[in-house]
Interface confidence: low
């Protein structure tokens, strides 16, 4: 899957802060992605849409059902992470339970962690819901570890 | 230092609109986003929007078709108007910057009251 | 929505002596590293003021006699010892999802 790209790179709402502190459950919680050389973060993400149904038609990229489902989806991270360094996505995968949704978010490097891309899109839900008539639960957000494999097929200028 | 200030019409006729600017100094709408809250005199507070550092706005959903944020970075303004007011939307209606990403809100203007009224 | 429930709705507490104020979540507004809830002190005529942020965190600037704690769905703030200056109306605030809510307001009275 192509990656798609953000046309913008302001600076994100995350990294313009006076907080004296804002202590992460453990030391390596509030750490950015494992970086690449480019200057980008890579995050995997998951998510239920539970008032969508899988069917054989999101296995095939051709088909209407997948195209406006990868679509809807590519637009709403383009708002969600609108105002900072999103990068874009890839890898957008569709798995059966409802629909799981898995996919790759790259990022500058510095701009976000892994706790405040989780944050923005559990901030996003209900807009989601009702902006794109997604429902959306049980959201996981990781690290990609590194070294980033190089079939994940994210190829994301720095 | 950072601050916000709200302007605006004071009295507004049922059924028209209002529209109200909020002006910041000290501070960068590229960098922080902006919310707006409402308090109904003697009442508590009531969120209604947000607009994000790059532009991306959020509505309270039972006011959602009756709002809408914007601004303009280079006039360091935020702007909230609402549609088709009502007696109800009588309150004092404030601006606040948005500390970063965890959503509270540091600094606050002094509010404009806003009175729908005939 | 997620609904702030606050109480008590108003109480007075003696000069010197603790206050404690609760703040309960209809679901949680937590996750694995933060607490989404933000406590605001506002007097008669004036703009709310930041207190407490994710539920523990001191704004700069506020005395260190306010303290915050919590997480999932109940949160508390405590003032010790409480000043003349404290007397105020005392809100809660979740930023967990949207949309962003308040609780109802708590009402502190100075003896």
């Known amino acids: 899957t192509p990656t798609t790209l953000a046309s913008h790179s302001t600076k994100t709402d995350a990294s313009s802060t006076h907080h004296s502190s804002v202590p992460p459950l453990t030391s390596s919680n509030h750490s950015t992605s494992p970086q690449l050389s480019t200057g980008v973060s890579f995050f995997f993400l998951s998510f239920h849409i539970s008032n969508l149904q899988f069917n054989s038609s999101l296995e095939d990229p051709s088909t209407d059902y997948y195209q406006e489902l990868q679509r809807d989806i590519s637009e709403m991270f383009l708002q969600i992470y609108k105002q900072g360094g999103f990068l874009g996505l890839s890898n957008i995968k569709f798995r059966p339970g409802s629909v799981v949704v898995q996919l790759t978010l790259a990022f500058r490097e510095g701009t976000i962690n892994v706790h405040d891309v989780e944050t923005q899109f559990n901030q996003y839900k209900t807009e989601a819901a009702s902006r794109y008539n997604l429902t959306i639960s049980d959201v996981s957000v990781s690290d990609v570890p590194f070294p980033f494999s190089a079939q994940s097929g994210a190829g994301v200028p720095g | 230092q950072v601050q916000l200030k709200e302007s605006g019409p004071g009295l507004v006729a049922p059924s028209q609109n209002l529209s109200i600017t909020c002006t910041v100094s000290g501070f960068s709408l590229t960098d922080y986003g902006v919310n707006w809250v409402r308090q109904p005199s003697g009442k508590g507070l009531e969120w209604l929007g947000e607009?994000?550092?790059?532009?991306?706005?959020f509505y309270n959903s039972a006011l959602k078709s009756r709002l809408t944020i914007t601004k303009d970075n280079s006039k360091s303004q935020v702007f909230l108007e609402m549609n088709s007011l009502q007696s109800h939307d009588t309150a004092m209606y404030y601006c606040?910057?948005?500390?970063?990403?965890?959503?509270?809100?540091?600094?606050w203007g002094q509010g404009t009251s806003v009175t729908v009224s005939s | 929505d997620i609904v702030l429930t606050q109480s008590p709705a108003s109480f007075a507490v003696s000069l010197g002596q603790r206050a404690t104020i609760s703040c309960r979540a209809s679901?949680?507004?937590?996750?694995?590293?933060?607490?989404?809830l933000h406590w605001y002190q506002q007097k008669p005529g004036q703009p709310p003021k930041l207190l407490i942020y994710?539920?523990?965190n001191l704004e700069s600037g506020v005395p260190a006699r306010f303290s915050g704690s919590g997480s999932g769905t109940d949160f508390t703030l405590n003032i010790h010892p409480v000043e003349e200056e404290d007397a105020a109306t005392y809100y809660c605030q979740h930023s967990r999802e949207l949309p962003y809510t308040f609780g109802g307001g708590t009402k502190l009275e100075i003896k």
């Open positions: 606040a910057k948005r500390l970063n990403w965890d959503s509270s809100m540091d600094y």
């Open positions: 994710l539920a523990s």
């Open positions: 679901e949680s507004v937590s996750t694995s590293a933060y607490n989404f």
């Open positions: 607009i994000w550092a790059g532009g991306t706005t």
